[in-house]
Interface confidence: low
């Protein structure tokens, strides 16, 4: 039975040209996290593999940085980065947990950031 839950940064906004941290946290389960995939719609951004470490998709390597933790930092944001992002936790023995984050990249300099998220 899957007892875990994913906490995410939720809906966030950031300024064009700036950077943002996408963060998820899996709680309420003792399952082992074997891999975390970060995806944007149907594109794979990055993998954090317990065995093999971080790998950033080649098409994003100039604008995506691993961390902090299992999170992902997006840099040099453009309006085209607006959209849904997913953290997909592959765990054993539970299976797969998915968290959703909606990012809005604003032209304006008055982007309102969501509440700061911290990993417990």
């Amino acid at each position: 039975m899957m007892t875990g839950t994913i906490e995410t940064t939720g809906n966030i906004s950031a300024e064009k040209g700036g950077s943002i941290i996408l963060q998820c946290h899996l709680s309420s389960t003792t399952a082992q996290v074997t891999q975390v995939n970060w995806e944007q719609q149907d594109q794979l951004l990055a993998i954090c593999n317990a065995d093999l470490g971080w790998h950033i998709s080649p098409s994003f390597k100039d604008r995506v940085a691993p961390g902090p933790g299992l999170g992902l930092t997006l840099q040099s944001l453009t309006v085209n980065d607006t959209g849904e992002y997913f953290c997909i936790y592959h765990t054993y023995p539970d299976g797969t947990y998915t968290g959703r984050i909606f990012l809005e990249v604003l032209e304006s300099s008055v982007a309102e950031h969501g509440a700061r998220f911290q990993i417990p």
């Epitope: 993998i47 593999n49 065995d51 790998h55 998709s57 080649p58």
Partner: antibody, heavy 116, light 110 residues
Framework: QVQLQESGPGLVKPSETLSLTCTVS????????MSWIRQPPGKGLEWIGI?????NTYYANWAKGRVTISKSSNQVSLKLSSVTAADTAVYYC????????????WGQGTLVTVSS | DIQMTQSPSSLSASVGDRVTITCQAS??????LAWYQQKPGKAPKLLIY???TLASGVPSRFSGSGSGTDFTLTISSLQPEDFATYYC????????????FGQGTKVEIK
């Protein structure tokens, strides 16, 4: 003594699934990376994929969607679906392959022919 | 993707010759490189790992050097049993990879 032995059918029909097993002895899969490699007749080595100590897998770009590597206590399995004549090759398993001390040792290899 | 390019693809040499094979990675792989020897009908045999460390039981006439993108396998004095095909292999990255091996270099008798 560390040993690897590939086994499986030597003949597979086109469009079917190729299934091979690598049986290991002398070391533990729980602390080892394991790779599958193939070599078409008269050609070079082609990497198929790797399975990590905790069961995580990475596959070659050309094999994604067709290949599955899994493991049990002392065996590593390779499944390659929808095979064609181009998949005819000698298939090897080897210990290591990712930031380790090279792939060593290798199994002796098993020839798989895809033909109707 | 990381591409591994070996050169030459083949070479002819005589017993006693010094032979050099090069391998170039399309991006920095630090020292995560291995070299293998393969004889016809046999499985590849590990010669060198971490770019320059000699594998157990490998004769000292084999040596490896390089880091980053450019690597070299040298056979200081070619012996009759060294006529074979040699492959380099990057161990740096296994995600989004087409092939970890170079295309091979066949060392033939002149």
């Amino acid at each position: 003594q560390v040993q690897l032995q590939e086994s499986g059918p030597g003949l597979v029909k086109p469009s079917e699934t190729l299934s091979l097993t690598c049986t290991v002895s002398g070391f533990s899969l729980s602390s080892s990376y394991m790779s599958w490699i193939r070599q078409p007749p008269g050609k070079g080595l082609e990497w198929i994929g790797i399975i990590g100590s905790n069961g995580n897998t990475y596959y070659a770009n050309w094999a994604k969607g067709r290949v599955t590597i899994s493991k049990s206590s002392n065996q590593v399995s390779l499944k390659l679906s929808s095979v064609t004549a181009a998949d005819t090759a000698v298939y090897y398993c080897a210990r290591g392959g990712y930031r380790t001390s090279g792939m060593d040792p290798w199994g002796q290899g098993t020839l798989v022919t895809v033909s109707s | 993707d990381i591409q591994m390019t070996q050169s030459p693809s083949s070479l002819s040499a005589s017993v006693g010759d010094r032979v050099t094979i090069t391998c170039q990675a399309s991006q920095n792989i630090y020292s995560d490189l291995a070299w293998y020897q393969q004889k016809p009908g046999k499985a590849p045999k590990l010669l060198i790992y971490r770019a320059s460390t000699l594998a157990s039981g490998v004769p000292s006439r084999f040596s490896g050097s390089g880091s980053g993108t450019d690597f070299t396998l040298t056979i200081s004095s070619l012996q009759p049993e060294d006529f074979a095909t040699y492959y380099c292999q990057q161990e740096h990255l296994v995600a989004w990879i087409y092939n970890v091996f170079g295309q091979g270099t066949k060392v033939e008798i002149k």
